[in-house]
């Protein structure tokens, strides 16, 4: 074509891959008529022609453009829809009159990269290679152009460095002529790199300008033989009998060594091992004292044979022994002295409380309590309480009953029951004394006795209502060595009809609902009759 | 027949470098443990480093950690023993020991050793 | 680190005689699972490379005469030998695995 060489650089049209190419043919009036105009695709230098107008009419050629041209803007325009990278070439228009002139378009076509997908080693790499390993493959797909690949380590770019650091980048073309691109980042690490995070980067063009994707942050697997192991031992602090103890070997090395956890005999001195759990942890559920002692992890690397002996560690499980209390059944005259001595063994300093069992009142802080003039109301339970303050909830009790040598006591002297005839009555009588008293009742029915402590008892009657029975009462006798008491129970009759929801607070009620010899639970809500009562 | 010979050693400065190589033979080189050992010159024995099979794991006393590397070239059948910063006290004869399949570490095949000296 | 102390450090013999040699660790070596020993011995004869005689502390590597015994467990363990040949004569190593490798400082077997 005469004077090709001076013609101007091509048109730029910029277009996406699916989208459509808008190629304005840019003769001027002067240089030819539009409305006559061939329009040819140029590849290798070769022209096809692809598309004809004539007097303003387009006409496509048969062939590879076919279905995707059109006209627009009054025949200035040539349109190119569902464009592809195939397209990327130069097409020119031909202006026929009055002489023959060319205008040249070239078309780039980009296409964005799907999501770079990264996938690291899964194999590792050890820190020692001698050269650089695969760390991860990064693929880049369907981008047009082909995109560039950019690498980060804990979001530094990683250069190429000889013997340290190798990118390796390959790119293969889909049959939609779009690029599949393939990084392969190859590095030798260093055990500081086990959490370093590795990801990378695309960049590519579009017609609005550049752009880039990043991909998901990895971490590789990176080996690195144990230099160290050592125990952990949970909870930290003091530990108490009781507790869940875990002991458990910890190497920095990757992988850990094979683990042992050995503790000394202390009569042998011998390092006997321990059975761990699936984990390797030993667990001490509940610990004892006897767990107390020296421990020691050993590592073995089962890829060298080497192994390797922590540092022992001394596990103390603190205990408090059983508490022993002397007298162990201390019995006294009333108006005497007692001193009840408390003893335990701790592997910590100990703390020593007396409390009366009955209230909960602390008596005495110490070891020793000393009781004097001894009434017969000090008989009963006295709690020795031996606890390490610094360790919370370590502690071990013991209790004492203290008896006081007296005739029978009775808890009441007398009591009045509201009874219907014919009911079957429960009654009711406790006494304590020391000897422990029994008690007998004045009339016939089912009794049962019960030993409420050394001191006391408890005796029920199960006695059917008689007119006899409303006339002579019931009476119930304690009696020990040391002698007898009575305490008396008037039964008066109750007309349940007239019986309010509170009327039980009167005078020990029995609000049973009863027929004739029908048994009512009749324990009932008995209270003291109003009048002061000796307790002799 | 199992062989083991060691090369590289040689008169050194302190500070400086040496790497020496062990080529084995009469046995499957890459299924054993290697190590390298060496004896003073008042006939001390002291372990010097080990290698895993297959090269990943490595293993020295803290004599020589950070200035001694173990490595091997399983292709070549060599192992080598590359050492920096080099001192008096790592004048020695150096033997490269092959360890058995016992579920031990022993040193069950020794080389003839190869001499370093260190001197200024 | 676990440090192995060789006694006697020379012994002079005549040949046929019993000769005992002792080895003791800073530690016990005995693993409690296996019953067994982190010891091994080793033999030096002049002019030669160190060979292996006995692991586990008392067994025989293959090919070792069984006038050789390794005895011993825990911290203290020796090497016997029944009846002493010439060429027994050479320098006696023991060395513990059982964290990291230490050898002894070697028991010399000189003839009288």
């Known amino acids: 074509v005469p004077g090709e060489a001076e013609q101007p650089a091509p048109e730029l049209v910029e277009v996406e891959v699916g989208s459509t190419a808008l190629l304005k043919c840019g003769l001027s009036q002067s240089q030819g008529n539009l409305s006559h105009v061939d329009w040819f695709s140029v590849h290798k230098e070769k022209r096809t022609l692809i598309f004809r107008v004539r007097q303003g009419q387009g006409q496509s050629e048969p062939g590879e453009y076919e279905q995707r041209l059109s006209l627009q803007d009054r025949g200035a325009t040539l349109a190119l829809t569902q464009v592809t990278p195939q397209d990327e070439r130069i097409f020119l228009c031909q202006g026929k009159r009055p002489r023959s002139q060319e205008y040249r378009i070239q078309l780039r076509v980009y296409k964005a990269p799907e999501e770079p997908n990264i996938q690291v080693n899964p194999l590792g790499i050890p820190v020692n290679s001698k050269e650089p390993e695969e760390v991860a493959t990064c693929v880049g797909r369907n981008g047009y152009p082909i995109p560039q690949v950019i690498w980060y380590k804990n979001g530094r770019p990683l250069k190429e460095e000889k013997n340290r650091v190798h990118i390796q980048s390959s790119q293969t073309v889909e049959s939609s002529g779009l690029y599949t691109l393939q990084s392969i980042l190859k590095a030798q690490l260093v055990k500081e790199d086990k959490d370093a995070q590795f990801y990378c980067e695309l960049n590519y063009r579009l017609p609005s300008g550049n752009h880039m994707k990043e991909s998901r942050e990895v971490t590789v697997p990176v080996f690195y033989p144990t230099e160290k192991v050592w125990l952990e031992v949970e909870p930290v602090g003091m530990l108490k009998e009781g507790d869940r103890v875990e002991i458990r070997c910890l190497a920095d090395g990757n992988p850990p060594p094979h683990f042992s956890i050995s503790k000394q005999n202390p009569s042998t001195r011998e390092a006997e091992e321990e059975t761990t759990n699936d984990n390797g942890v030993l667990v001490l559920e509940p610990a004892r004292k006897e767990h107390s002692g020296r421990y020691e992890c050993q590592g073995l690397d089962l890829d060298t044979m080497i192994s390797l002996l922590s540092e022992p560690q001394e596990l103390l499980v603190n205990y408090v022994s059983d508490v022993r209390v002397s007298p162990a059944a201390p019995e006294r005259q009333e108006g005497s002295s007692l001193t009840l001595t408390c003893e335990a063994e701790s592997s910590q300093d100990l703390e020593f409380q007396w409390l009366r069992e009955e209230t909960g009142q602390v008596l005495e802080r110490g070891p020793v309590l000393q009781l004097h003039d001894l009434k017969r109301e000090a008989g009963g339970g006295y709690r020795c309480v031996a606890s390490v303050p610094s360790i919370p909830g370590l502690n071990r009790t013991q209790l004492v009953n203290v008896a006081i040598f007296g005739p029978p006591w009775m808890a009441f002297k007398e009591r009045k029951v509201w009874v219907k005839e014919n009911m079957v009555l429960n009654l009711s009588c406790e006494a304590s004394g020391h000897p422990r008293p029994t008690i007998s009742w004045n009339v016939n029915g089912t009794a049962s006795e019960q030993d409420q402590d050394p001191q006391r008892v408890l005796s029920t009657l199960n006695v059917l209502v008689t007119p006899e029975l409303l006339e002579t009462g019931v009476e119930c006798t304690a009696s020990n060595d040391l002698g007898k008491n009575t305490s008396i129970l008037f039964l008066e009759l109750v007309n349940l009809t007239t019986l309010t929801p509170d009327s039980n607070t009167t005078t020990g009620l029995s609000t049973s609902t009863a027929s004739p010899h029908t048994r009512a639970n009749s324990t009932s809500t008995e209270r003291k009759l109003p009048e002061p009562e000796s307790r002799g | 027949d199992v062989k083991l010979v060691e090369s590289g050693g040689d008169l050194v400065k302190p500070g400086g470098s040496l790497k020496l190589s062990c080529a084995a033979s009469g046995f499957t080189f890459s299924s054993y443990i290697m190590s390298w050992v060496r004896q003073t010159p008042e006939k001390r024995l002291e372990w010097v480093a080990t290698i895993s099979s297959g090269g990943s794991s490595t293993y020295y006393p803290d004599s020589v950690k950070g200035r001694f590397t173990i490595s091997r070239d399983n292709a070549k059948n060599t192992l080598y023993l590359q050492m920096s910063s080099l001192k008096s006290e790592d004048t020695a004869m150096y033997y490269c020991?092959?360890?058995?399949?016992?579920?031990?570490?022993?040193?069950?095949?020794w080389g003839q050793g190869t001499l370093v000296t260190v001197s200024a | 680190d676990i440090v192995m102390s060789q006694s006697p450090s020379s012994l002079a013999v005549s040949a046929g005689e019993k000769v005992t040699m002792n080895c003791k660790s800073s530690r016990s070596l005995l693993n409690s699972r296996i019953r067994k020993n982190y010891l091994a011995w080793y033999q030096q004869k002049p002019g030669q490379s160190p060979k292996l005689l006995i692991y586990w502390a008392s067994t025989r590597e293959s090919g070792v005469p069984d006038r050789f015994t390794g005895s011993g467990s825990g911290t203290d363990f020796t090497l016997t030998i029944s009846s002493v040949q010439a060429e027994d004569l050479a320098v006696y190593y023991c060395k513990q695995s059982y964290n990291l490798l230490t050898f002894g400082a070697g028991t010399k077997l000189e003839l009288k």
């Open positions: 020991t092959r360890d058995d399949d016992y579920d031990v570490k022993v040193f069950a095949y």
